[in-house]
């Protein structure tokens, strides 16, 4: 029962951070203008993996794609490539811990194969959530160096009088999303890898002895021994619901008639 | 169309408060800021303030503040600027307007003259 | 704040000939974010609101003549009207659109020659 609950848990947390981290991937805000020392702003500029976002007072929304690939920073394409591998990972893990799941029963699959494919998803969650945490890990460091360089040449001066304002930078909400995902991820993986070591049949091989009776020639031949745990059958008729993730890039306070690509 | 109508002239003795209103119609009033703008006689152009009638949050200019309050009545699309402890230099046409892209001000009331004088 | 300053404060064109007005931000008003800069261009004849012509610094608003047209980035930007009429007789304001609070140039008073 604990080794179902266990495994059920599992694939409930991972299921959550796969969609988080989804959610967190195409999120716009993986950078924001950084309003510190002037929190109410005509202009508000953030960044995303795909495209960069300029939200301004008056409520209308203009978003651009990256549309070049060679033009981009290394660093982009590396958070890019952690997260959409982080994803796919996550997605056939998802796929095999299904099939996996003790409560359900596919044709006479034996438990050994189900502890097998349980820790086959339990290791794809866990490196899902690493490249998850890896990539918003990359992107955070990458801000912290740039904010800081962009600090260090905040006011440009341009014929004395005259000034340009750089445009610093710091963490949005979608790295938040992701650390909390990668970190949902890498938990559910771990609890399948646990919950497989529950299922793995400890089956004590007795060699095949054969006991000779008078006047009956029965033989005995006991083999690996398996505990039934009442779950083969689903008599509970219970439903598989397979929840669709919705994702909000960010709250606007106008309506979606207001942005415009 | 989007039409701004503002309420009549008003003539106030220095110390008072003057509150001007401007009915929005033509468009969902809750969807666009509404910019306030003053033009003194013979002079430019100056932004006292816009508010946000979804949130009521607005957002002044510093020279202006502590002395002007915008607010919304949504169930009448109907915004209002009360400027207090009046001084002869704030007689001006006041103007509210309103936001398009750009931050630009496409739409504009039709203004308010306020007379400061003893 | 950002100051604007305009000019010249007056100008004085012939019917048909090309006006032009400068306006200069202290500050630049280009955003990076999507390399548009925050200035707009008003209209105002006597007795009348302010006519939205230009945002963006050089996008023209929708019922503008194409005889006005706005250029320039950073902190220094013009207002062109090709081809002078009559009704172009006003004057002409810029505004900074980027950072609170908003401002405007003095004002350049357009006449005829």
């Known amino acids: 029962m604990a080794v179902t609950a266990c495994q059920g848990l599992g694939f409930v947390v991972s299921l959550i951070g796969i969609a988080g981290i989804i959610a967190a991937t195409c999120m716009d805000q993986w950078s924001t203008q950084d309003l510190y020392n002037n929190p109410v702003t005509a202009v508000f500029n953030y960044q995303g993996l795909w495209r960069s976002c300029v939200r301004e007072s008056s409520g209308f929304t203009e978003c651009r794609g990256y549309f070049t690939l060679l033009g981009l920073p290394a660093m982009l394409q590396a958070v890019r490539a952690l997260m959409i591998v982080g994803i796919v990972l996550g997605a056939i893990g998802l796929l095999v811990s299904i099939f996996a799941l003790k409560c359900i029963r596919i044709g006479s699959m034996e438990d050994s194969a189900k502890a097998n494919m349980t820790l086959t998803s339990g290791i794809m969650f866990i490196v899902s959530g690493l490249c998850a945490i890896a990539g918003v890990s990359v992107f955070a460091n990458m801000l912290v160096t740039n904010f800081w360089m962009s600090t260090a040449n905040m006011y440009t001066g341009m014929g004395g009088m005259v000034q340009t304002v750089q445009t610093r930078y710091t963490f949005g909400a979608a790295l938040f999303v992701g650390w909390v995902a990668g970190g949902l991820t890498l938990i559910g993986g771990v609890m399948m890898c646990i919950a497989c070591r529950g299922l793995a049949p400890e089956e004590t091989n007795y060699k095949a002895v054969s006991y000779h009776a008078s006047g009956h020639s029965v033989a005995y031949k006991p083999g690996g021994f398996k505990a039934s745990t009442g779950f083969g059958s689903n008599t509970k008729n219970k439903k598989i619901y397979d929840g669709g993730a919705r994702t909000e890039d960010e709250v606007q306070s106008y309506p979606s008639k207001h942005d415009y690509v | 169309q989007i039409q701004l109508v503002q309420s009549g002239a008003e003539v106030k003795k220095p110390g008072a408060s003057v509150k001007i209103s401007c009915k929005a119609s033509g468009y969902s009033f809750t969807d666009y800021h509404m910019n306030w703008v003053r033009q003194a006689p013979g002079k430019g152009l100056e932004w006292i303030g816009n508010?946000?009638?979804?949130?009521?949050?607005?957002t002044y200019n510093h020279k202006f503040k502590g002395r002007v309050t915008l607010t919304v009545d949504t169930s009448t699309s109907t915004a209002y600027m009360e400027l207090s402890s009046l001084r002869s230099e704030d007689t001006a046409v006041y103007y509210c307007?309103?936001?398009?892209?750009?931050?630009?001000?496409?739409?504009w009331g039709q203004g308010t003259l306020v007379t400061v004088s003893s | 704040d950002i100051v604007m300053t305009q000019s010249p404060s007056s100008l004085a064109v012939s019917l048909g000939e090309r006006a032009t007005i400068n306006c200069k931000s202290s500050?630049?008003?280009?955003?990076?974010?999507?390399?548009?800069?925050?200035l707009t261009w008003y209209q105002q004849k006597p007795g009348q609101p302010p006519k939205l012509l230009i945002y963006?610094?050089?996008t023209r608003e929708s019922g503008v003549p194409d005889r006005f047209s706005g250029s320039g980035s950073g902190t220094d930007f013009t207002l062109t009207i090709s081809s002078l009429q009559a009704e172009d007789v006003a004057v002409y304001y810029c505004?900074?659109?980027?950072?609170?609070?908003?401002?405007f140039g003095q004002g350049t008073k357009l006449e005829i020659k």
């Open positions: 505004q900074n659109d980027y950072s609170f609070p908003f401002t």
């Open positions: 500050q630049s008003l280009l955003n990076s974010g999507n390399q548009r800069n925050y």
């Open positions: 963006w610094a050089s």
């Open positions: 508010i946000d009638p979804y949130y009521g949050s607005p």
């Open positions: 307007a309103n936001y398009g892209r750009g931050n630009s001000f496409p739409y």
